[in-house]
Interface confidence: low
């Protein structure tokens, strides 16, 4: 249970004095418009603060954009607006920060009407200096860096041209016209769709998918009749219009579009959509929308080829195209995902999977919470998590669920306890075991963040009134201390800490307001003196992830292996430090049927772990075509789940079947073919 602030909580000694010495205020003069904040690089301490404006705007009212720079994690800021020649920077482009530790920044400016192109300011030294460059085009999108080489940039123009720079924006070349969407792939490859007739919208479903592997010297058309495309992990997906009607299907490629296979997924109609919810190099979570404006669909999980899909979750909440889904990857524990389903009575319930979509269950009720009014049985209910959908519905939910890879097992989220999500004011809940068990952590809605790889959790109450108090916990949310960081309360706008949760600095952003003036202000608090010593071996304890039954030899086995982690003891008040690396010890498990999914032409009957052959494939929406012609597929009905590392144990060997299926996709098969040679 979570004692809150009662006698069981060991207080951090002298924390007020320690934090007061490490609280840094910065008042921003003449800061108006939208404020955006970006970290430049990892562990550099460099933060850029920029005020941006929507176009068009009344120049007389606002003056120019302001740019501030900090190199000490936000404790001090320097006005560097002169480096961008007092220009307007456009809100929709923000700051384009280069990948990794490249130190590159691109700001896109608004230039006065009639100019032949836009203007950018470029820095490659962590924003110490900027170079102004006039563009030969007006950008439509933010500059996109190649993940492999931060000198390579691409952008779309307002005229639908695809522009590429090979020298970090110094020179630009239009490599293609009539482009709708462009994305970097691996190895500096660019994928893009083009229209032939009127426009992107008019040609939707008749677009061509192109690839260039040499930044526009040569091109290859890798798909036609394209509706859209997406990249996820090592997979390239295209939704392709069917020949005879307005439906479309997903095709997948694992070789950058050289070869395509039809994904064994339902086709969708005009009003429906596909969405890649998550993807890694092993597999993909794909959402397929239901027909009609239902607001839900089905989650499917793929095999290692991205071709064969297993139904994972029905009635998955996902509002109309481009809308909201609560699908969340819990990055603090392997295999864990949380999302929402829309039940028959139109209530929304949270589901969690611990095995990468194999099984979904409700979240266990926190022991220190009561079931609310949504519960039919006051003793039996579940925790339901508020995520993107609740935020979009303007419920009192200031933040989505939070987890960090280096804060093992920790998940923090707003939620309610009952039979479904409640519209009442939520509380904040924490799990320290990746979502298996939960505890109420804070009453009412809060902003929260994780520092020092989980060593500190910081929270600020969500309130319409000015605030001046921050809460922090050094024991994974069991006990909380409060610290008054300023005498003059501020209207709070955001909590900012360096991405990656390794920092011990937190910045509180807000503004002071009086009758005539308002000023932006930030308070940066460094917690280093609270955690006054480095953690030692004795501060860590061994924790077996996914453990549900310690008596069971296979306890903790998920996707064929178990992992033991060294976790910081809750009672230890010490620094993990910026160089902290998660220590884990994996061990391989024996295979069971749970480690296999059913291959093409096979399915699992309800409550059975065996894969049985489909009685007959006619009427099933199952098409398997690797090569755009009749495919001879030998299978024993089972296929190892992607990422599963089990060895030995059950080896589901049975008579090998030779399945033959006709490929019906024109996308894959230029001429109608069959298994006989001509």
């Amino acid at each position: 249970s979570a004692p809150g602030e009662d006698e069981e909580c060991g207080r951090v000694r002298d924390f007020v004095a320690k934090l007061a010495n490490n609280t840094h205020q910065h008042v921003f003069d003449d800061l108006r418009g939208s404020v955006s904040l970006s970290w430049v690089g990892d562990s550099t301490g460099v933060i850029l603060v920029l005020t941006t404006f929507h176009v068009p705007l009344v120049i007389m009212t606002f003056g120019q954009s302001k740019l501030y720079r900090s190199e000490d994690y936000g404790k001090n800021f320097k006005d560097i607006t002169d480096l961008i020649n007092n220009t307007f920077i456009r809100t929709e482009f923000g700051m384009a920060i280069g990948p990794e530790n490249s130190g590159k920044v691109v700001l896109t400016a608004e230039v006065s009407g009639g100019s032949r192109g836009g203007r950018i300011f470029r820095s490659s030294d962590f924003a110490k200096n900027f170079v102004q460059t006039d563009l030969p085009f007006h950008p439509l999108t933010q500059m996109m860096y190649s993940p492999q080489n931060s000198d390579y940039l691409l952008a779309l123009s307002t005229e639908n041209g695809l522009w590429v720079s090979k020298n970090f924006g110094g020179k630009w070349e239009e490599i293609h016209k009539a482009v709708c969407l462009a994305k970097w792939g691996s190895d500096n490859t660019i994928f893009f769709t083009t229209y032939a007739n009127g426009s992107c919208k008019a040609d939707l479903g008749a677009l061509e998918l192109w690839r260039t592997s040499d930044l526009g010297k040569s091109f290859k058309t890798i798909g036609v009749k394209i509706y859209s495309f997406g990249l996820g992990g090592r997979f390239l997906f295209a939704s392709v219009m069917a020949d005879k009607d307005t439906t479309r299907r997903i095709h997948v490629s694992t070789d950058q579009g050289d070869t395509w296979s039809m994904a064994q997924l339902p086709s969708v109609g005009q009003e429906q959509f596909y969405s890649i919810l998550a993807a890694n190099d092993d597999m993909v979570f794909m959402h397929v929308d239901e027909p009609g404006d239902t607001g839900f669909g089905t989650i499917f999980t793929s095999d290692d080829r991205g071709i064969v899909y297993s139904k994972s979750l029905d009635r998955h909440l996902y509002t109309t195209t481009g809308g909201e889904t609560d699908f969340t990857n819990v990055t603090s524990l392997r295999g864990v995902y949380i999302t929402s389903v829309l039940s028959e009575d139109n209530s929304i319930q949270t589901m969690i999977t611990f095995d990468q979509g194999g099984r979904w269950t409700h979240l266990r009720k926190p022991e220190n919470s009561e079931c609310d009014a949504t519960a039919k049985n006051k003793n039996e209910c579940s925790l339901h998590i508020h995520a993107s959908y609740s935020i979009s519905q303007k419920l009192n939910v200031p933040m989505a669920p939070l987890s960090e890879p280096n804060a093992v097992g920790i998940v923090i989220a707003h939620g309610s306890v009952g039979d479904a999500i409640s519209v009442m004011v939520p509380d904040v809940y924490i799990s320290d075991d990746g979502g298996y068990s939960w505890t109420k952590m804070l009453e009412g809605p809060h902003y929260y963040t994780i520092l020092d790889s989980g060593g500190i959790i910081v929270a600020i109450e969500h309130s319409s009134r000015p605030i001046n108090v921050i809460k922090f916990s050094t024991d994974e949310g069991q006990c909380w201390q409060t610290y008054t960081f300023t005498r003059d309360p501020i209207y709070f706008t955001g909590l900012a800490s360096e991405p990656g949760a390794r920092s011990m600095n937190i910045s509180i952003w807000g503004f002071t307001a009086s009758f005539l003036t308002s000023q932006w202000v930030s308070y940066t608090i460094d917690f280093k003196d609270i955690l006054e010593r480095n953690c030692e071996e004795k501060d860590y304890t061994i924790w077996l992830a996914h453990s549900t039954d310690p008596e069971d030899y296979e306890d903790g086995c998920i996707l064929g292996y178990k992992e033991q982690f060294l976790r910081l003891r809750k009672s230890s008040v010490c620094q993990n430090g910026r160089d902290y690396v998660v220590t884990k010890q994996p061990s391989i498990c024996l295979c069971s049927l749970e480690d296999f999914l059913c291959d093409f032409g096979y399915y699992r009957p309800e409550n059975d772990s065996k894969c049985v052959e489909q009685p007959e494939l006619k009427g099933h929406d199952l098409e398997f075509c690797l090569y755009g012609r009749e495919e001879h597929l030998t299978t024993n009905g089972y296929r190892k789940i992607p990422g599963d590392k089990c060895q030995g144990g059950v080896n589901p060997v049975r008579e090998v079947k030779d399945l033959k299926k006709k490929c019906t996709s024109n996308f894959l098969s230029p001429e109608k073919q069959n298994s006989k040679s001509n």
Epitope: T254, W260, E631
Partner: antibody, heavy 129, light 107 residues
Amino acid sequence: QVQLVQSGAEVKKPGASVKVSCKASGYTFTSRYMSWVRQAPGQGLEWMGIINPVGGSTSYAQKFQGRVTMTRDTSTSTVYMELSSLRSEDTAVYYCARDPSGIAAAGPASRYYYGMDVWGQGTTVTVSS
Amino acid sequence: EIVMTQSPATLSVSPGERATLSCRASQSVSSNLAWYQQKPGQAPRLLIYGASTRATGIPARFSGSGSGTEFTLTISSLQSEDFAVYYCQQARLGPWTFGGGTKVEIK
């Protein structure tokens, strides 16, 4: 650099099987298909089939259907071609060749074949009683 | 299957001269055609792909043209190292098929 190294020459009796290996290096093994092509003494090139290293899926020329099996081992970046029920007409040099496009056409106006751009050195298989 | 026919079977050309090799497909293969060069005791080498694109490292004297069913490989000025057997190959429909080859020999 990108290369394909094949196993050594084999002498087999009619009715036996032969298994030729082809080890790839210098590129991501699973990113390209692999074709097998043979050449009988004094004859032209004959395509036998193709394997997709990602899932191990195969497609064989009708002539070899039922006699040829292509497999791969991603841990060693190696593909194998096994030909059974050997007869004297199977005496040939067997080549593996990296085939970037595989057989999956991307649609009528859009196919662009890149050709078999890297070849193994060849493995001579002699079938003789 | 698609049958590829090459002509002539043998072409005698003097060094420095132009050589034109033909390849005909029994049905359209669009531009899904490659040309290979093979010297005695060696593996084939890719020369041209996509009917007309030179492979990496192939000299400019080699060029490919054609689309559909008729294709041509041209060697503008034969060098001594160009005397070899040349094969065309289609990749429009499985199974892939090769032409019978054209032997380019010294006149």
